[in-house]
């Protein structure tokens, strides 16, 4: 029975050349988190494994930093970074929870954060 919910930073925007923190939080469950994957569409960005710690995909090593916590920091943003990002929580005994974040990278200096929202 999956009772948990994932709270994410929702729809967010950031300036080109800047950085942004992608953050998800799993709540309302006592499930053990064994691994968290961060993905952009179908590309794996990073993994945080309970035993092994962080693994950053080689193609993103220069622009992705682990943390804070189970979050992920994207640096040196480009317009091509605009799109959907997913946090995938592998847990026991609940199973797999997925959260979605939409990032828009703006050319201008006007970059406002969207409201937080929850995904069941």
């Amino acid at each position: 029975m999956m009772t948990g919910t994932i709270e994410t930073t929702g729809n967010i925007s950031a300036e080109k050349g800047g950085s942004i923190i992608l953050q998800c939080h799993l709540s309302s469950t006592t499930a053990q988190v064994t691994q968290v994957n961060w993905e952009q569409q179908d590309q794996l960005l990073a993994i945080c494994n309970a035993d092994l710690g962080w693994h950053i995909s080689p193609s993103f090593k220069d622009r992705v930093a682990p943390g804070p916590g189970l979050g992920l920091t994207l640096q040196s943003l480009t317009v091509n970074d605009t799109g959907e990002y997913f946090c995938i929580y592998h847990t026991y005994p609940d199973g797999t929870y997925t959260g979605r974040i939409f990032l828009e990278v703006l050319e201008s200096s006007v970059a406002e954060h969207g409201a937080r929202f929850q995904i069941p």
Epitope: M2, Q32, N37, D51, G95, T96
Partner: antibody
Framework: EVKLVESGGGLVQPGGSLRLSCAAS????????MSWVRQAPGKGLEWVAV????????FYPDSVKGRFTISRDNSKNTLYLQMNSLRAEDTALYFC?????????????WGQGTLVTVSS | DIQMTQSPSSLSASVGDRVTITCHAS??????LSWYQQKPGKAPKLLIY???TLASGVPSRFSGSGSGTDFTLTISSLQPDDFATYYC?????????FGGGTKVEIK
């Protein structure tokens, strides 16, 4: 080349015990979760246990919980399955599997299996 | 537990045929589904994961689709090497469970 070689199967009486081993080579054993999957004669596949890369967690289905124990020795690149209180329905070919590091539920490599027969 | 139901349980086909196998999950499993191929006397082999991603070294005639509760494995042009039993497996929640298998036989 990834290689998984199971051993330790055989004939055992109901209520008896058996310990299976799986010798792994061709990959960084200590960086991968490992599982046991079984297949009763002429039947389908059933997952029976998983252990994390560092051995910090182990999970089982209800059908074997409390009777089977999965363990590993990373210094010997070996996976184990201790089976106690064996029943006729435990008769099966037991496969050792490596779990994909990205998605822990995926069994990306399999051994050839060792046969366990529980009969009086 | 999530039940995985495959259909058909067996089928007969000829070399060159297009073959479709379906897998139904008793509840939503998102895209957390894998397909495996098993030949008699051999260990299963991973074909597809995450519903539609081809595993390394698997021929492009194999494809997977679906999301939620209904999934499909398609072999676009059946080859002699493809006669085997195919299993789906869900990774949405514990315990990980497999379908009953679909045996693809020569017509």
């Amino acid at each position: 080349e990834v290689k998984l070689v199971e051993s330790g199967g055989g004939l055992v009486q109901p209520g008896g015990s058996l310990r299976l081993s799986c010798a792994a080579s061709g990959f960084a054993f200590s960086s991968f979760d490992m599982s046991w999957v079984r297949q009763a004669p002429g039947k389908g596949l059933e997952w029976v246990a998983v252990i994390s890369s560092g051995g910090s967690y182990t999970f089982y289905p209800d059908s074997v919980k409390g009777r089977f124990t999965i363990s590993r020795d990373n210094s010997k690149n070996t996976l184990y399955l201790q089976m106690n209180s064996l029943r006729a329905e435990d008769t099966a070919l037991y496969f050792c599997t490596r779990q994909d590091y990205r998605y822990p539920y995926i069994m990306d490599y399999w051994g050839q299996g060792t046969l366990v027969t529980v009969s009086s | 537990d999530i039940q995985m139901t495959q259909s058909p349980s067996s089928l007969s086909a000829s070399v060159g045929d297009r073959v479709t196998i379906t897998c139904h999950a008793s509840q939503n499993i998102n895209v957390w589904l894998s397909w495996y191929q098993q030949k008699p006397g051999k260990a299963p082999k991973l074909l597809i994961y995450k519903a539609s991603t081809l595993a390394s070294g698997v021929p492009s005639r194999f494809s997977g689709s679906g999301s939620g509760t209904d999934f499909t494995l398609t072999i676009s042009s059946l080859q002699p090497d493809d006669f085997a039993t195919y299993y789906c497996q869900q990774g949405q929640s514990y315990p990980w469970t497999f379908g009953g298998g679909t045996k693809v036989e020569i017509k």
